[in-house]
Interface confidence: low
């Protein structure tokens, strides 16, 4: 039997609105929460496309809005149909597309053939799809200033580019309980947005924005040394596309040091953590002298996922120690700061031989005093596999 | 912060024209549609219409298409409503707001027009 | 175009009361949004979406409502609360507004 309804099923999943004039919007529409093609065409009425008409519609493959009065796709108007690969909204009073309303989907295709669209940098995006052959765009029609059936492109007088964006940073080192002043400046053309990302800033310092287009200001009262390693970005929008540039403020601190007990891996482990902005310098003394790095006594850092702190993790490790490594190990740290030590007693094995003198020590010691010719413990960072 | 300035009253004559503004600032003007609306005395509130300043994209309630005109001046932020062919009917507080992805988000104080002769 | 009917016209409630009033759209809209005016000073967007405040709203108001029937209430009626609220489809050219419920304080 024929459908007289405004909009028809097709098939199992499909719906047709073709009864001219009879939509306004799409909000509502009965039974589309399985929708995955919606099909309208004729609607003189329907103007304005907004995220709100196409919220439930989460499973939406193919819209196509044709041969309508449509005038006004908004930003975020795709919010909810993230799975959207085929849009048509040729023959429609489209002069304009913002690059944000396809953000973040995986067009195969894109139709706007039609459409009185308005050749400017809002659209450049656009022309760069059509150049780069990009998922199947037609346009046909981009008018500059008068109508035309050809792709024409922007003059070459006309410069359409994203924002550029800079963030100022103080010149002076920052130290724990400052305050630290940003800056940034925008520069572009049509700039419509712009704002800080501070998300990782959370307990690290009391955020204070002030400004607006182009130069947008931040204070960061109190900063604490967990600022060390967070990214501070600032974004621009325009007609053409978005732009962002992130710093990270270092602050200054102390060095500090913990040591854990002997553990028994592949080699054994004395394990530490260091922390202190700048990086401090390590040294290990052995019974009250330096100790000088061997291939089988080394320094390991271990590799750590979080690139978001100063902390650094390692190991002191050594190769099938005997009872000749056994002793107190200290861990010296320092930086421009301030310097921290900390010692752990690490017993390998017993002595085998109790009553005889004590077999040559395998690991060079001297004395710590200004005359001591060893040289400094090598750090050997990440590129020492573990183990 | 964002501001939309409006003189407090107009007086025209029946028959004339009266070009209403409302100055924007702490925003970015061409961003945001602006809309115009009217509200007689002890009445409610009737939308007119609605423009967008980065391209001058105008919308109209049928009711006002013929006698309402809205433009806008970039360089000043500045939005213009012109409504011609005053009767007493006009007499109202006429309202500018600023939209951009939710409704009309700051009003102006609005200005005062009585039609009188 | 869409009429909004908002009901009661004018209803006065007593401090610590709850107020509930509505507003019936004569088509299905997405969202309802409510603005409230008090004498002689310009509207204030006061929910949006139907159900989200605006800044600086206190949170005894709330909103709710979906297809053509929505709601405005106010958990705890508080003086300053006396104004009228008018209620605003943003779904359709014309855009429209209910003609508004004046609520008073007893």
């Known amino acids: 039997a024929s459908c007289r309804e405004v909009c028809c099923p097709v098939g199992p999943s499909g719906l047709r609105c073709t009864r001219a004039g009879s939509l306004d919007t799409l909000r509502g529409l009965r039974g589309a929460g399985n929708l995955t093609e919606l099909y309208v065409e004729n609607q003189q009425h329907l103007q304005r496309l907004e995220f709100e008409d196409l919220q439930g519609l989460g499973e939406l493959r193919s819209l196509t809005i044709v041969k309508s009065g449509l005038r006004f796709v908004a930003p975020d108007a795709f919010r909810f149909t993230p799975r959207l690969s085929h849009l048509n909204l040729s023959s429609n009073a489209l002069e304009s597309l913002s690059w944000k309303t396809v953000q973040g989907l995986s067009l195969q295709d894109l139709t706007l053939s039609g459409n009185p669209l308005h050749c400017s940098c809002a659209l450049f995006w656009l022309q760069r799809w059509e150049q780069e052959g990009l998922c199947g765009v037609h346009t046909q029609t981009l008018h500059d200033s008068g109508p035309g059936d050809q792709f024409l492109p922007l003059g070459h007088n006309t410069s359409c580019g994203v924002p550029t964006v800079k963030i100022q940073m103080p010149n002076d080192s920052v130290e724990v309980g400052d305050d630290v002043f940003l800056q940034c400046q925008v520069e572009g053309l049509a700039l419509q947005q712009a704002d800080w990302i501070l998300t990782e800033l959370e307990g690290a310092a009391t955020v204070k924005k002030f400004g607006d287009l182009p130069s947008l200001g931040l204070i960061l009262v109190n900063v604490t040394s967990d600022l060390n390693k967070k990214n501070v970005t600032c974004w621009a929008e325009n007609d053409v596309g978005r732009a962002e540039v992130s710093v990270q403020v270092s602050v200054s601190f102390p060095a500090s040091v913990h040591l854990g007990l002997a553990v028994e891996q592949h080699h054994w482990c004395i394990p530490f953590s260091v922390d202190g902005q700048p990086a401090p310098s390590l040294r290990w003394l052995f019974n009250g002298s330096v100790l000088n790095e061997t291939s089988f006594i080394f320094t390991q850092f271990l590799e750590s996922a979080l690139t978001n702190e100063t902390m650094r993790h390692g190991c002191l490790r050594l190769n099938q120690p005997t009872h000749v490594n056994n002793g107190n190990y200290t861990l010296l740290a320092a930086n421009p700061y301030g310097q921290a030590a900390a010692s752990v007693m690490a017993a390998f094995m017993d002595n085998p031989f109790e009553f005889n003198p004590e077999d040559p020590i395998p690991v060079s010691f001297s004395p710590v005093d200004g005359n001591s010719t060893s040289r400094d413990p090598v750090e050997k960072k990440d590129e020492t596999p573990f183990g | 912060q964002v501001q939309l300035q409006q003189p407090g009253a107009e007086l025209v004559k029946p028959g004339a024209s009266v070009k209403l503004s409302c100055k924007s600032s702490g925003y970015t003007f061409t961003n945001y549609w602006m809309h115009w609306v009217k509200q007689r005395p002890g009445q409610g509130l009737e939308w007119i219409g609605e423009i967008y300043p980065s391209n001058g994209r105008t919308n109209y309630n049928e009711k006002f298409k013929n006698r309402a005109t809205l433009t806008v001046d970039i360089s000043s932020s500045t939005a213009y409503m012109q409504l011609s062919s005053l009767t007493s009917e006009d007499s109202a507080v006429y309202y500018c707001a600023r939209s951009r992805y939710d409704p009309m988000e700051d009003w102006g104080q609005g200005t005062s027009v009585t039609v009188s002769s | 175009q869409i009429v909004l009917t908002q009901s009661p016209a004018i209803m006065s409630a007593s401090p610590g009361e709850k107020v509930t009033m509505t507003c019936s759209a004569s088509s299905s809209v997405g969202y309802m949004h409510w603005y409230q005016q008090k004498s002689g000073t310009s509207p204030k967007r006061w929910i949006y979406?139907?159900?989200k405040l605006a800044s600086g709203v206190p949170t005894r108001f709330s909103g709710s409502g979906s297809g053509t029937s929505y709601s405005l209430t106010i958990s705890s009626m508080e003086a300053e609360d006396a104004a009228t609220y008018y209620c605003q489809q943003w779904s359709s050219i014309p855009l429209t507004f209910g003609s508004g419920t004046k609520l008073e304080i007893k």
């Open positions: 979406d139907t159900s």
